[in-house]
């Protein structure tokens, strides 16, 4: 229904802590370099306005939309140009076109610093002091560096986050608390980062009926026995809320999925058996508990697929009549009926089945022609459960660092033209995979295995398109998002690429390394690799790996030497020199 | 492919009317978004108003907000534009355009893979 003032009714269903929140959230995507204090000060200024127009709707621009009110705000703000750029030529539009290209300049990969945890001792005092500047300062440093994460999910994040210090700050050992537990978090929220962004780009460049493909089959995989009509409702609906945080309306997003999680909840008797245990919570982990729950129990007594879909005579009169509901009951039925494949694989055979059906419904014997399809989609099956099965072999092999290595040699050998940086990143995101499907149950890895990949390539795709340097990426990332993983994967080593010349400096180390955390270490070791390989894209696994032992070997005996500078400035160009003639 | 044919453009007074309308042939089950946009001599195409074929959900530039209303008549596969109270800063091309996909970016004409030939609004007195 309409509302006299769209501010004042958001204020009410979110309620004050969560509308500041999300209006933080909105700031801070937006305009990414803003202070906390800079944007914590409109997101008064917002409130302030809002409990005005909830005590009088009536009152001036009161009536405006939120996106008018928030694009005035952000466009009042001083030196707007100096700090972005053209961004700011966005103020001389109107709204909606004004919204609509501040989206267009958020930046996926913003030149802020990496976000530092402080040390437990510190970080308790400054959360005991303020809890909600503290937890407002999480907001925002999450939001500036990741500009799609979803809103509602990231006030969930901070709840968790809160839960934790309040916990751990309280313990004697607040160190070994804290750390386990705030990791845990950092890891889930990367990953929920990548996996929305992956859903803004389906509707980016795609729009919402890919989008709302996808959801009907991920929505099938968990609720089997939901009927059809229930599915496309969900569909509908998640396409909707999706649709808003994309869109940057943070508000509505987050009220709109709280009033699906609210459905849900009131409908578990035609949606799934599993969701009482994520009712009975309040509502961020509610809504949260929702969107992982387990799959439901598959019903016993379902069809062969083919009954419907191959078998009937009425196929092509059927597929004529309504192509989307009759493509999208396809979907469902065969959805329900594999939650052991990925998202991307079951759309892949959604988008065969309507080729074939294309093709087959104008010729003259339909049934002669479509007969065969379901036989047609073994080898579509077959790539990703053998792109699992030799993964996660190399993997338990290997080990998570090892297998990143594998992953970034095999990726700078396609694209060599890609940055290091950008390299590096994408290995060791691609090798977290194996930690985190390849020990999971048999049937549980492939959807795992091949709908994290995509989210991490569709990063990949992201960072490339904005100084695009391989032809092979460019192709990969210009088809359709679900034949992405497949193309990546097919992709073999760039026969145009012209090699590197060996810059003795881009090998050269120094002692400091020795004191660096571990991660930082792999990375300084990973970047030395990707250069190895872009010197020589043919080198074979088995001198990489006399190298890369080498170079171990060299860090371990200087950062135990006493004088590790010395140590550095001469066994340095020796390991240059051996490195130089083992890839000869 | 889908086909629009725009028509009911012309010369009219400020604070006058006019109704454009916009044939659609073809899949035209496809356009799941249709929108108007207007280009102005020397200036760049602009939005103007877009529907939601399946839902009719509608959104407006703020400056035609409350003059002008967008509509669609899904038996005659017809999209519609009321223009009310028109300004000389009206002046310009209209343009029927059609999105299949429903793109998250309604503003942006390169979402529209499907666009009429245009039909002018003149406003002057």
């Known amino acids: 229904e309409a509302h006299k003032s769209e501010i004042a009714h958001r204020y009410n269903d979110l309620g004050e802590q969560h509308f500041k929140g999300l209006v933080l959230i909105a700031f801070s995507q937006y305009l990414q370099k803003c202070s906390y204090d800079e944007h914590a000060k409109l997101v008064q200024e917002v409130t302030d306005f809002a409990k005005t127009c909830v005590a009088d709707e009536s009152a001036a621009n009161c009536d405006k939309s939120l996106h008018t009110l928030f694009g005035d705000k952000l466009c009042a703000i001083p030196n707007l140009r100096e700090n972005y750029g053209e961004l700011a030529d966005c103020c001389t539009k109107q709204e909606p076109e004004r919204n609509e290209c501040f989206l267009q300049h958020k930046d996926d990969n913003p030149s802020l610093p990496p976000f530092e945890r402080p040390e437990a001792e510190a970080m308790c005092t400054s959360f005991k002091e303020n809890p909600t500047t503290f937890m407002g300062h999480y907001l925002h440093e999450v939001a500036r560096r990741h500009p799609y994460f979803y809103a509602p999910e990231l006030l969930y994040y901070a709840e968790q986050y809160n839960e934790i210090l309040t916990q751990c700050c309280a313990e004697a050992d607040k160190e070994s608390c804290l750390t386990p537990k705030l990791d845990g978090v950092k890891e889930k929220a990367l990953v929920s980062s990548v996996r929305q962004r992956m859903k803004c780009s389906s509707m980016q460049k795609f729009g919402e009926r890919a989008f709302k493909a996808w959801a009907v089959a991920r929505l099938s995989q968990t609720f089997p026995n939901a009927d059809f009509a229930e599915i496309t409702k969900l569909a509908t609906d998640l396409t909707k809320v999706n649709k808003e945080c994309c869109h940057g309306d943070l508000l509505e997003c987050a009220d709109d999925r709280a009033e699906l999680a609210k459905y849900m909840c009131e409908n578990q008797a035609t949606i799934s058996s599993k969701l009482q245990t994520c009712c009975d919570k309040p509502l961020l982990k509610k809504a949260h508990c929702l969107s992982e729950v387990e799959h439901d129990t598959m019903p016993a007594d379902l069809p062969a697929i083919a009954a419907d879909f191959v078998e009937d005579q009425e196929v092509c009169k059927n597929y004529a009549e309504a192509k989307d509901v009759f493509l999208g009951t396809f979907l469902y039925e065969y959805s329900r009926r594999h939650p052991d494949y990925s998202v991307s694989l079951l759309l892949r055979l959604a988008k065969k089945y309507e080729a074939t059906l294309e093709k087959c419904c104008a010729e003259a014997n339909p049934p002669a022609c479509y007969g065969t399809v379901l036989a047609e989609f073994q080898p579509l099956v077959e790539e990703p459960k053998n792109l699992v099965k030799t993964n996660c072999d190399l993997y338990e092999k290997l080990g998570e660092y090892g297998f990143q290595n594998a992953i970034l040699v095999r990726y700078t050998q396609k694209a060599p033209q890609v940055s290091t940086p950008t390299l590096v990143e994408a290995a060791r995101n691609l090798g977290r995979v194996g930690t985190k499907c390849c020990t999971l149950p048999e049937d549980q890895r492939l959807p795992c295995v091949e709908d994290y990949l995509s989210a991490i390539l569709n990063r990949v795709c992201l960072l490339h398109e904005k100084t695009p340097v391989s032809e092979h990426v460019t192709k990969c990332c210009s088809g359709s998002l679900v034949e992405r993983r497949p193309c990546f994967s097919a992709l073999t080593v760039d026969e145009t690429y012209v090699p590197k010349e060996f810059k003795a400096e881009t090998f050269t180390f120094h002692s400091d390394i020795c004191t660096l955390p571990e991660k930082e270490k792999q990375i300084k070791k990973q970047t030395a690799l990707a250069e190895l390989v872009k010197h020589k894209p043919k080198a074979t696994a088995e001198q990489l790996k006399t190298v890369m032992d080498d170079f171990a070997q060299f860090l371990d005996t200087c950062c135990k030497a006493a004088d590790k500078d010395t140590c550095f400035s001469t066994e340095g160009p020796n390991l240059v020199t051996r490195c130089k003639d083992a890839l000869a | 492919e889908v086909q629009l044919v725009e028509s009911g453009g012309g010369l009219v007074q400020p604070g006058g009317s006019l109704r454009l309308s916009c044939a659609a042939s073809?899949?035209?089950?496809?356009?799941?978004?249709m929108g108007w946009f207007r280009q102005a001599p020397g200036k760049e195409r602009e939005f103007v108003s877009a529907?939601?074929?399946?839902?009719?959900?509608?959104v407006y530039l703020d400056s035609v907000k409350g003059r002008f209303t967008i509509s669609r008549d899904n038996a005659k596969n017809t999209l519609y534009l009321q223009m009310n109270s028109l300004r000389a800063e009206d002046t310009a091309v209209y343009y029927c355009?059609?999105?299949?996909?429903?793109?998250?970016?309604?503003?942006?004409?390169?979402?529209?893979?499907?666009w009429g030939q245009g039909t002018q609004v003149t406003v002057s007195s």
């Open positions: 073809g899949r035209t089950d496809s356009a799941y978004r």
């Open positions: 355009a059609a999105d299949p996909d429903s793109r998250l970016y309604y503003t942006v004409p390169q979402n529209y893979d499907y």
């Open positions: 529907i939601n074929w399946s839902d009719g959900r509608t």
